[in-house]
């Protein structure tokens, strides 16, 4: 048993038929010694008396809010949550496996630049009686500070008969050094509680591996005289790290016809302009990627040819 926060405790249970469970001793937080009784949740049934209560926790019926009273007055509460381990593996019932980039990916994180700021998100079909809290650090044995805001509900989607909820959190490394080579990964830990079930989820990554630039900005076309060619120009996104001479991007320029079946013409360049042939009803799109490290491409920025 361990304390998640004040008066909230997690009991770790091996979950199999006829498992013996865990013996837990609860202590009433009071200077009183006599006349103390214990109840669970809203029940008025007295479970025991005295300053301590010993219980055998085997199932969710044994979890909940234990309250000690004296003469009708509430003295203190202890909320017991269960963390299930089945066949040596902690349960992951609350969050949805996003399966990207691999199976058992419950948390996904992205950074727009090397400032040490990043966003993580997760999905669930559960909405009621649900709590998420997030902690983060760089390294785990001698952790360096990363500050995360409170998690937020960031999207609701209907998926068939189910509603899917996306939650996200923004974090910032306290003493980020954008130009430094990372040697210790960032660790993100999400505590999830649904009703009386506790689970925790972790993700470990280097900022360089989760970089995804914003799309190029100010995408413009300039027709070239007496030619079907156009000069496409764009700028680095505002959110990208500076100086651009050091934090350089490479770009992919694509000409795409109206029909998805039409052949796409692609040009790769380190410059912020390119010359391409603009076909009727086509559109021109540009995306960006870190020039020196193959992390994710940005989303496309697009303009019509006409």
């Amino acid at each position: 048993i361990w304390e998640l926060k004040k008066d909230v405790y997690v009991v770790e249970l091996d979950w199999y038929p006829d498992a013996p469970g865990e013996m837990v001793v609860l202590t009433c937080d009071t200077p009183e010694e006599d006349g103390i009784t214990w109840t669970l949740d809203q029940s008025s049934e007295v479970l025991g008396s005295g300053k301590t209560l010993t219980i055998q926790v085997k199932e969710f019926g044994d979890a909940g809010q234990y309250t000690c009273h004296k003469g009708g007055e509430v003295l203190s509460h202890s909320l017991l949550l269960l963390h299930k381990k089945e066949d040596g593996i902690w349960s992951t019932d609350i969050l949805k496996d996003q399966k990207e980039p691999k199976n058992k990916t419950f948390l996904r994180c992205e950074a727009k630049n090397y400032s040490g700021r990043f966003t993580c998100w997760w999905l669930t079909t559960i909405s009621t009686d649900l709590t998420f809290s997030v902690k983060s650090s760089r390294g785990s044995s001698d952790p360096q500070g990363v500050t995360c805001g409170a998690a937020t509900l960031s999207a609701e989607r209907v998926r068939g008969d189910n509603k899917e909820y996306e939650y996200s959190v923004e974090c910032q490394e306290d003493s980020a050094c954008p130009a430094a080579e990372e040697s210790l990964p960032i660790e993100v830990m999400v505590d999830a509680v649904h009703k009386l079930k506790y689970e925790n989820y972790t993700s470990s990554f280097f900022i360089r591996d989760i970089i995804k630039p914003d799309p190029p900005k100010n995408l413009q076309l300039k027709p070239l005289k007496n030619s079907r060619q156009v000069e496409v120009s764009w700028e680095y996104p505002d959110t990208w790290s500076t100086p651009h001479s050091y934090f350089s991007l490479t770009f992919c320029v694509q000409v795409q016809g109206k029909s998805k079946r039409e052949k796409k013409d692609r040009v790769f360049t380190d410059k912020t302009s390119a010359t391409v042939i603009c076909r009727k009803n086509a559109s021109i799109s540009v995306r960006a990627q870190d020039r020196y490290y193959s992390s994710s491409w940005s989303e496309w920025a697009s303009v019509p040819c006409s």
């Epitope: 809290s133 805001g149 409170a150 937020t152 509900l153």
Partner: nanobody, 122 residues
Framework: EVQLVESGGGLVQAGASLRLSCAAS????????MGWLRQAPGKEREFVAT????????YYADSVKGRFTISRDNAKNTVYLQMNSLKPEDTAVYYC???????????????WGQGTQVTVSS
């Protein structure tokens, strides 16, 4: 730390509206997710609604969805609960609460106000 003071409760007829306010003191208000919770006599405290620190997507208990609206004004350090089409079963003490977590559970809020009584008569 954040201190919370609710106001706006009262006695109304079924079908009427009320607007609760919660004034927060402390510069950190804008970093907390805020919630409204309620407790009817002899019942457990129950979750009503929550709004995130960035005033993003609010979330409501099914029992109040479509009738209640939670909002916040970070410039005024205030969170609101607009309650329309009130029913007798909405009678309770309403609490404003703050959390560093996202929670649709009454159990995981860190800071609580003293509460304001809402009574809906039929």
């Amino acid at each position: 730390e954040v201190q919370l003071v609710e106001s706006g409760g009262g006695l109304v007829q079924a079908g009427a509206s009320l607007r609760l306010s919660c004034a927060a003191s402390g510069r950190t208000f804008r970093s907390y997710n805020m919630g409204w919770l309620r407790q009817a006599p002899g019942k457990e405290r129950e979750f009503v609604a929550t709004i995130s620190w960035n005033a993003g997507i609010p979330y409501y208990a099914d029992s109040v969805k479509g009738r209640f609206t939670i909002s916040r004004d970070n410039a005024k350090n205030t969170v609101y609960l607009q309650m329309n089409s009130l029913k007798p079963e909405d009678t309770a003490v309403y609490y404003c609460a703050a959390s560093n977590s996202w929670s649709s559970s009454a159990r995981f809020y860190d800071y609580w106000g003293q509460g304001t009584q809402v009574t809906v008569s039929s």
